[in-house]
Interface confidence: low
């Protein structure tokens, strides 16, 4: 079964989240300063004149950049797409960032960078105070407070309305941690298997407390070489594993929730090009806890892989959790050849 | 006894670590690029003239800030002050930093940002190439690898001289593990009694993987609403918690140590202002491990807490732990009134 | 190079006590553990105890109620004891070395050239 | 106390074969398990730590996994100097305890 049932489509997580209709209240956007208090907080909502017609920082944004804008989604929200303004103000305004960066973070505690697949956080904003600019973020975040940090090249007035675009993360997974990709090396090509937007931490082969590729709703193609995403390189979509850095035979990962769930069923979307070394997991075991600091409870739940290995299209697998509750969850994938690629991992949970 | 016996005193803790009197060798200086030989890290010793005399990097450092300068000092050190200085040579050299920002790293894989007690990062540099500039820093860091990221705000060379001065980390404290400081609500104030100088990670809310305020030889005063530091807020020496949020009736921490040691003395500096809440603890409980994947060893150190604990006055108490070996130690201390306030632990081993 | 030399009687008297000495050279006891180990052809290889660097002393709980374990590290010495010994004591003895620094923290990777003992009247 | 059970008991072997001797712990002890060889009238010698970590000096033909319970060793290529007894045993907690051996015998 090769598509994801249940799992979030990110073509279609592209609703307004509530500045411009108000459904985000003003008491959820705030600012790091205001120019006054009619360019204050609640004048940042796209398409909005209300007072002077805009939120504009107290102070100049060159060259520090610390001014910012907040917006408290209040849960944990997909967030695909952003929307810029200046400050219109029916003419009378001229002010708005020509660039500015986003940061994000899921508890308010941890701030990361929005970047781009190529590592760069400025992103290109308006070129005039009326028109609105949407942004397509590739890779989306996974966030419940997001920052927009207004840039300028010289000492100027900068004045920002926004919009954010996306739907509420259901999943509710808030991080996994997994031993870091590896590369491929085949005859004529690399293959960078790492999960190149991954938002946590890396120490010591092993990366976590974040979110990457396969939390981000894109699944990988049949031949793991190619990529639904343009201008990048071979192995993108996929996050992969060599059995030969295992010598325990299995990948193990930890997935982090954000509350107590009862886990019906773990979607793994899987390369099987095994004319290339890729293949299904063998099997999965998975154990549960509660808390971060109690003991995975009792057995695993195991599933043993049969059926169509041969064929070599990627597909999805599902793994029956059996109802297990848990806020914790640790799977072990066992090898079946000499690769494991993932490109996706989702839960259906209530 | 209100003192901390054996205890660091930072006041002293301000030798030259080796830059300039070259105990620092070359190979422990690196940079992330030079602009020729004759600025290369070699040359970034304080009041040094060798070569064109000061480190430069190759490229601008606006406006990404990414060149930097690494000092290796091989084992764990407090590092208390930097000074620096730009390229005077003999007048010829007018290239300075006016400001920069402090990595550091305990590992070699981990780096942290130093920031000011205000979390602010960046620090003030030079205003002339030749002069010496000294910042106090404040937390200091305990690091073995330190990296000076020199700043500018427009694009303009920089050039750089350093000297680390501080001490070295005998107690070989690596990181403690405890829960999230609280807030005390006192009728005329909030008191918070959160780690803020906390340099690991915080999850579950609870803090592990880092040093901070218990950790910076900053014992706290009686009045725990008071503090040794300027412009901070009240409780700022202090971490404290409610019995009410730990239904088990104890704080439970963890130490993590650089090697294994055989453990005389823990030493914990508590608040005892008994008339706003905060007591001594009742007891201590501690155990031990020599790695990381071992169990706790066998029955538990206790020292029960009597004497003068109507006395309000802050103190540091000693707890006796019998010469046990580990590089782990987990300590519970009992509450015997609505809150524990520490301010600083240490440890006596060999 | 690293040596653990063993001396001690190959003959003891049941109830009686056994001691047996090991000499170290090559290294010195900082950063290491001495183990003890015994092997019997019933048993297989048995664990007893351990002195740590500082003096420090782990047993077997089986075997806590009479075994000492000591040092005298001038001397690069350790001492093991085993009181009461019965027949089924029969074994071959080891002392081994174990590292206990993070960055070489192996397993046993010197051992003694054993000490044989035949528990016997 | 941890009890490693270790499979099986005698190999008969000739040379050039590929050996594989398991353990497995009665509850996880991470990877802190360790094999040694003992030949006759000899003292065990360490060959591999933390599961799979090669000692110093020990050939290359000479392997060691697992993590948890179940660990593996095996001797790729078998040579008439690896006939002995190996024997597996757990770092993790004490009491440390040992696996009963495996003796490796010539056809």
């Known amino acids: 079964d090769a598509d994801m049932k249940g799992h979030f489509d990110p073509a279609k997580c592209r609703y307004a989240l509530g500045m411009q209709d108000r459904t985000i209240p003003d008491s959820d956007i705030s600012v790091s300063s205001s120019w006054s208090d009619s360019t204050a907080a609640r004048h940042s909502r796209l398409e909005s004149s209300d007072g002077d017609g805009a939120w504009c920082p107290a102070g100049p944004v060159f060259p520090k950049e610390e001014e910012y804008l907040q917006v408290d989604l209040r849960r944990l929200h997909l967030v695909a797409l952003v929307g810029t303004q200046g400050r219109h103000a029916g003419g009378l305004g001229k002010e708005f960032s020509r660039s500015y960066r986003l940061r994000y973070s899921r508890d308010g505690r941890r701030w990361m960078d929005w970047k781009d697949r190529w590592g760069q956080e400025v992103i290109s904003g308006n070129e005039d105070p009326g028109g609105v600019v949407l942004k397509d973020l590739g890779p989306p975040m996974v966030a419940r407070l997001v920052r927009f940090y207004p840039r300028a090249d010289r000492v100027m007035s900068v004045c920002l309305r926004v919009e954010l675009y996306g739907c509420l993360w259901r999943d509710g997974l808030l991080s996994y941690t997994a031993p870091v990709g590896q590369t491929m090396q085949l005859s004529e090509v690399m293959v960078h298997l790492n999960d190149s937007t991954y938002d946590g931490y890396t120490a010591g082969g092993l990366q976590y407390g974040g979110l990457g590729q396969l939390a981000d709703g894109v699944v990988g193609l049949d031949d793991f070489r190619q990529s639904q995403e343009l201008r990048v390189w071979p192995g993108y979509d996929y996050v992969g594993w060599s059995n030969q850095s295992f010598p325990t035979g299995y990948v193990e990962m930890e997935f982090e929730f954000d509350r107590l769930r009862t886990f019906q069923t773990m979607q793994v979307h899987c390369n099987n090009m095994h004319t290339l070394g890729a293949r299904l997991p063998g099997g999965v075991e998975c154990r549960f806890k509660r808390g971060p600091a109690m003991a995975w409870e009792g057995e695993p739940v195991r599933h043993a892989l049969g059926g169509s290995l041969g064929d070599p299209r990627a597909r999805a697998i599902s793994v029956p959790l059996g109802g297990h509750v848990g806020r914790f969850l640790q799977c072990r994938f066992l090898f079946a050849g000499p690769w494991l690629l993932f490109s996706e991992i989702s839960f259906i949970s209530d | 006894d209100a003192d901390m016996k054996g205890h660091f005193d930072p006041a002293k803790c301000r030798y030259a670590l080796g830059m300039q009197d070259r105990t620092i060798p070359d190979s422990d200086i690196s940079v992330s690029s030079s602009w020729s030989d004759s600025t290369a890290a070699r040359h970034s010793r304080l009041e040094s003239s060798d070569g064109d005399g000061a480190w430069c990097p190759a490229g601008p450092v606006f406006p990404k800030e990414e060149e930097y300068l690494q000092v290796d000092l091989r084992r764990l050190h407090l590092v208390a002050l930097v000074g620096t200085q730009g390229r005077h040579a003999g007048g010829l050299g007018k290239e300075f930093s006016r400001s920069y920002r402090l990595r550091y790293s305990r590992d070699g894989r981990r780096w942290m940002d130093w920031k000011d007690r205000w979390g602010q990062e960046v620090i003030s540099g030079n205003e002339d190439p030749g002069g010496v500039v000294l910042k106090d820093l404040g937390p200091p860091m305990v690091a073995r690898l330190v990296r000076f990221y020199p700043r500018a705000d427009r694009v303009m060379s920089v050039c750089l001289r350093v000297e680390l001065y501080g001490c070295l980390w005998r107690d070989g404290l690596l990181s403690y593990t405890a829960p999230v400081g609280q807030t005390m609500q006192l009728s005329e104030v909030m008191v918070h009694l959160n780690d803020s100088t906390y340099d690991g990670y915080t999850a579950g809310g609870l803090q592990y993987g880092g040093l901070g305020q218990l950790a910076d030889g900053v014992v706290g005063l009686d009045d725990f609403r008071q503090s040794q530091e300027l412009r901070v807020w009240p409780g700022y020496d202090y971490v404290g918690w409610s019995n009410q949020s730990f239904p088990t009736g104890y704080v439970e921490m963890e130490f993590e140590f650089d090697r294994l040691r055989t453990f005389q003395t823990m030493q914990v500096h508590c608040n005892n202002m008994h008339t706003l809440g905060a007591r001594l603890p009742g007891g201590v409980e501690c155990r031990f491990k020599r790695g990381p994947a071992m169990a706790w060893e066998g029955e538990p150190v206790r020292h029960a807490l009597g004497g003068s604990l109507g006395d309000p006055r802050a103190r540091a108490i000693s707890v006796p732990l019998g010469g046990h070996v580990g590089r782990f130690l987990q300590c519970r201390f009992l509450f015997a009134g609505p809150w524990l306030l520490f301010s600083e632990i240490s440890f006596i081993s060999d | 190079q690293v040596q653990l030399k063993q001396s001690g009687p190959g003959l003891v008297q049941p109830s009686q006590s056994l001691s047996i000495t090991c000499t170290v050279s090559?290294?010195?006891?900082?950063?290491?553990?001495i183990h003890w180990v015994r092997q019997s052809p019933g048993k297989g290889l048995e664990w007893l105890g351990v002195?740590?660097?500082?003096?420090?002393?782990d047993y077997n709980a089986a075997f806590i109620s009479r075994l000492s374990i000591s040092m005298d590290s001038s001397k690069g010495q350790v001492f093991f004891k085993m009181n009461s010994l019965q027949a089924n004591d029969t074994a071959i003895y080891y002392c081994?070395?174990?590292?206990?620094?993070?960055?070489?923290?192996?397993?046993?990777?010197?051992w003694g050239q054993g000490t044989s003992v035949t528990v016997s009247s | 106390s941890i009890v490693m059970t270790q499979t099986p008991k005698f190999l008969l072997v000739s040379a050039g074969d590929r050996v594989t001797i398991t353990c497995k712990a009665s509850?996880?002890?991470?990877?802190?398990v360790a094999w040694y060889q003992q030949k006759p009238g000899q003292s065990p010698k360490l060959l591999i730590y933390?599961?799979?970590n090669r000692y110093t000096g020990v050939p290359d033909r000479f392997t060691g996994s697992g993590y948890g319970t179940d660990f593996t060793f095996t001797i790729n290529t078998v040579q008439a100097e690896d006939l002995a007894v190996y024997f597996c045993?757990?770092?993790?907690?004490?009491?440390?305890?040992f696996g009963a051996g495996t003796k490796l015998e010539l056809k």
């Open positions: 081994a070395r174990r590292s206990t620094t993070v960055v070489a923290d192996y397993a046993m990777d010197y």
């Open positions: 090559g290294f010195s006891f900082t950063g290491y553990g």
């Open positions: 002195i740590w660097s500082g003096g420090i002393t």
């Open positions: 509850q996880s002890v991470s990877n802190d």
């Open positions: 933390y599961a799979s």
């Open positions: 045993q757990q770092d993790y907690t004490s009491p440390l305890t």
